[in-house]
Amino acid sequence: VPRWRQQWSGPGTTKRFPETVLARCVKYTEIHPEMRHVDCQSVWDAFKGAFISKHPCNITEEDYQPLMKLGTQTVPCNKILLWSRIKDLAHQFTQVQRDMFTLEDTLLGYLADDLTWCGEFNTSKINYQSCPDWRKDCSNNPVSVFWKTVSRRFAEAACDVVHVMLNGSRSKIFDKNSTFGSVEVHNLQPEKVQTLEAWVIHGGREDSRDLCQDPTIKELESIISKRNIQFSCKNIYRPDKFLQCVKNPEDSSCTSEI
């Protein structure tokens, strides 16, 4: 008799999820010698333990604490790059600027980026058919709670000048409902963080507007200022040139505005 299974609105667990997480962990510890001590089988067991046999709408940050403990990692607190709705460029930037880190450059972020996962209450099965959608089903699902947990910890760890890359092509350049707007902004520690510097990335070739004057950026400035953190903003008019100049700063064309 086929067992009744909850149908959720979102896509199911990414195929080969356990193998992918384990392989990414092994590769990460190989690429980052400072994390060689990590036992990837234990990491997978802790990851699995956070959501297996639990109702996928009833996941808590507490469920992820064993994984958080195993994935504890020290990144230079003054070299943190946050991003919102512009992940690919942020990742390209940190590949070139090797001393800066996005969340996905840390072990836990690297393990989970672009993956989906969920289990089922009272069974040890992973649900490959469907998982809860944040809007249509529930917010306390395994994926959303994971990113909320790691994002909060990442923001809490930041110090000095924190950079955030924002997508200037979106109607809301700063979105209060994004992970950056709802979690990271509110978990920067004013006693450690002096300045949040926003980099607004322009999409159009001929777009010379000052997007730092956008109402949503002013809203971000207001939120940050109320938290006793200074705010600054820069337009990145040419993201392609920006990356090229990070890579080759001595290039003569890199003295002009990017």
Epitope: R16, V21, R24, K27, Q95, D114, K247
Partner: nanobody, 117 residues
């Protein structure tokens, strides 16, 4: 499945040079990397050098300053230029493709490099 085809191995005298090539059936993009590993008789396979999509490289300490990894993204090809070869560089050299999204390593068949003294 990513297919990898290596070439360029052979026998060379100490102090000589060789250039290995590896063509992949898929381009290097995002967090995927291509690289070279080697395995000497009776030893474990070890990383020699790797290159990421934006040309970011890292090397094993034992080959720094002698070996250079480079890529031609248009040709999906990675090269390993090996100069000032030493007898201890003798090994089978394997091309590697790490596919981040799939969490998979793909390997070439291997090409023998022998350095005689």
């Amino acid at each position: 499945e990513v297919q990898l085809v290596e070439s360029g191995g052979g026998l060379v005298q100490a102090g000589g040079s060789l250039r290995l090539s590896c063509v992949a059936s898929e381009r290097i993009f995002s967090r995927n990397t291509m690289g070279w590993y080697r395995q000497a008789p009776g030893k474990q396979r070890e990383l020699v050098a790797r290159i990421a999509s934006l040309g970011i490289t890292n090397y094993a300490d034992s080959v720094k300053g002698r070996f250079t990894i480079s890529s031609d993204n248009a040709k999906n090809t990675v090269y390993l230029q090996m100069n000032n070869l030493k007898p201890e560089d003798t090994a089978v050299y394997y091309c590697n493709y790490w596919h981040y999204a799939a969490g998979r390593d793909y390997w070439g068949q291997g090409t023998q490099v022998t350095v005689s003294s």
